[in-house]
Amino acid sequence: KKVVLGKKGDTVELTCNASQKKNTQFHWKNSNQIKILGIQGLFLTKGPSKLSDRADSRKSLWDQGCFSMIIKNLKIEDSDTYICEVENKKEEVELLVFGLTANSDTHLLEGQSLTLTLESPPGSSPSVKCRSPGGKNIQGGRTISVPQLERQDSGTWTCTVSQDQKTVEFKIDIVVLAFQKASSTVYKKEGEQVEFSFPLAFTLEKLTGSGELWWQAERASSSKSWITFDLKNKEVSVKRVTQDPKLQMGKKLPLHLTLPQALPQYAGSGNLTLALEAKTGKLHQEVNLVVMRATQFQENLTCEVWGPTSPKLTLSLKLENKGATVSKQAKAVWVLNPEAGMWQCLLSDSGQVLLESNIKVVPTW
């Protein structure tokens, strides 16, 4: 007996072929011998079966000896053995209908778990294999669990249900609610305007929630809330902002914050959280600010950086067009009695310049 797998809500064609390529009498019945559809003259007739309003046949193929039954909007309970009677012979087709659904909303926060549940007909013993957009493979039986969703799990999951050496494929769109980056660092010279951007890794038609930026300055003993805001249908409105620093916030997405000027006392790291309406948990993005200052005081030229820097970063003072350089894997470098000329202070990572500040040393007579 032929086995056909179908998907809940989908359409399936159960084929039945006569040996002679011509229009002939045929009818389809279920395992209880209840007629579903058949032919009377050239007319398609329907029987008393529950399936009748969802069953059809293609008239144009009858002349080719093909008497398929098409079942629309499949239900799990349509799983049955169907009998096609044509040319005094009976063809049996076993239809197994499966459904695969996400237990919760398919819009989940990063770190939350995803559970997929398989609906299957009684007596079946299917196996399920799912592949994430990032290529991660997960296997299971009636349920499949992904304990901690990551950003790269966003997209179309392809799940293959196997039964009796036949397969049926399901596609489930999962949206992982997260910021595009887990962390970002902004490098600025003292006095420059600072722009922080927090792009989201997803789009939703209606996006409503509230957020806050907590800031831990390197020089401060505790963190403080710099700004709180509301998000309504992708429109941003500030609720409360500190007086120092006086941050400004963009009214549209992506979330955008402006610090009028980078000062050593602001250098540090912040955590922006966003709580979305009807979602438990919060989205997080870490942001770091590194501030550079180059100064000349009497016979001492100093370059300093504040903020979270990696120990492997190099700070250098270099005289333009001259070989004179002083470098350290430290947060401050200095030169005593510097030569006159344009000096460059450079913060670099494996040769790549992250931040540079120029200072002119005038000759002392």
Partner: antibody
């Protein structure tokens, strides 16, 4: 709600090959046949051919020698190729789903064949 | 091939009128016939299938009848949005064929 979105080159020179693709959204290719129909002022609505998920095709005998319809189940797409086009192939080309009747339809692509 | 002939090729009518369009098949097609409505610049839209079944979402003022070779589409009370071109199509055998259309115009 199944929707069909179609695309392809709109301007061709005589003897070139017409290529159009249709993507199925909000449903799958399963259980139905997927057709191409064209409409020109001279010939009205003309059925070109059809294909199902497993690649089984039926073509209009008047175009059979020049037509190929193919399917890509992984992308839920089907395509039309019509070789050696002439000015007589200038028409609006529609993709559509068929069981016995055509519903729904794509928006149509105007294909002009001109030297 | 089965030829489908529609008549008249065009008809003028007023809002509220009852209009009947006809379609004739060159051979017996039982009830394997559909009617479509097409507005300028748009794709055809299925109205009636299996000669007399109303497609979901189509207003009940549209009705179809007939069997064998002669079929009719009736609009019981014309509305402004009904002015369009109407096509019949046979699904009895390959190749599927359409009528040449009846254009329904405002009088």
């Amino acid at each position: 709600q199944v929707q069909l979105q179609q695309w392809g080159a709109g301007l061709l020179k005589p003897s070139e090959t017409l290529s159009l693709t249709c993507a199925v959204y909000g449903g799958s290719l399963s259980g139905y046949y997927w057709s191409w129909i064209r409409q020109s002022p001279g010939k009205g609505l003309e059925w070109i051919g059809e294909i199902n998920q497993s690649g089984s095709t039926n073509y209009n005998p008047s175009l059979k020698s020049r037509v190929t319809i193919s399917v890509d189940t992984s992308k839920d797409q089907f395509s039309l190729r019509l070789t050696s086009v002439t000015a007589a192939d200038t028409a609006v080309y529609y993709c559509t789903r068929v069981l016995n009747w055509f519903d729904p339809w794509g928006r149509g692509t105007l294909v002009t064949v001109s030297s | 091939d089965i030829q489908m002939t529609q008549s008249p090729s065009s008809v003028s009518a007023s809002v509220g009128d009852r209009v009947t369009l006809t379609c004739r098949a060159s051979q017996d097609i039982s009830n394997w016939l559909a009617w479509y409505q097409q507005k300028p610049g748009k794709a055809p839209k299925l109205l009636i299938y299996a000669a007399s079944s109303l497609q979901s979402g189509v207003p009940s003022r549209f009705s179809g009848s007939g069997s064998g070779t002669d079929f009719t589409l009736t609009i019981s009370s014309l509305q402004t949005e009904d002015f369009a071109t109407y096509y019949c199509q046979q699904a009895n055998s390959f190749p599927y064929t359409f009528g040449q259309g009846t254009k329904l115009e405002i009088k």
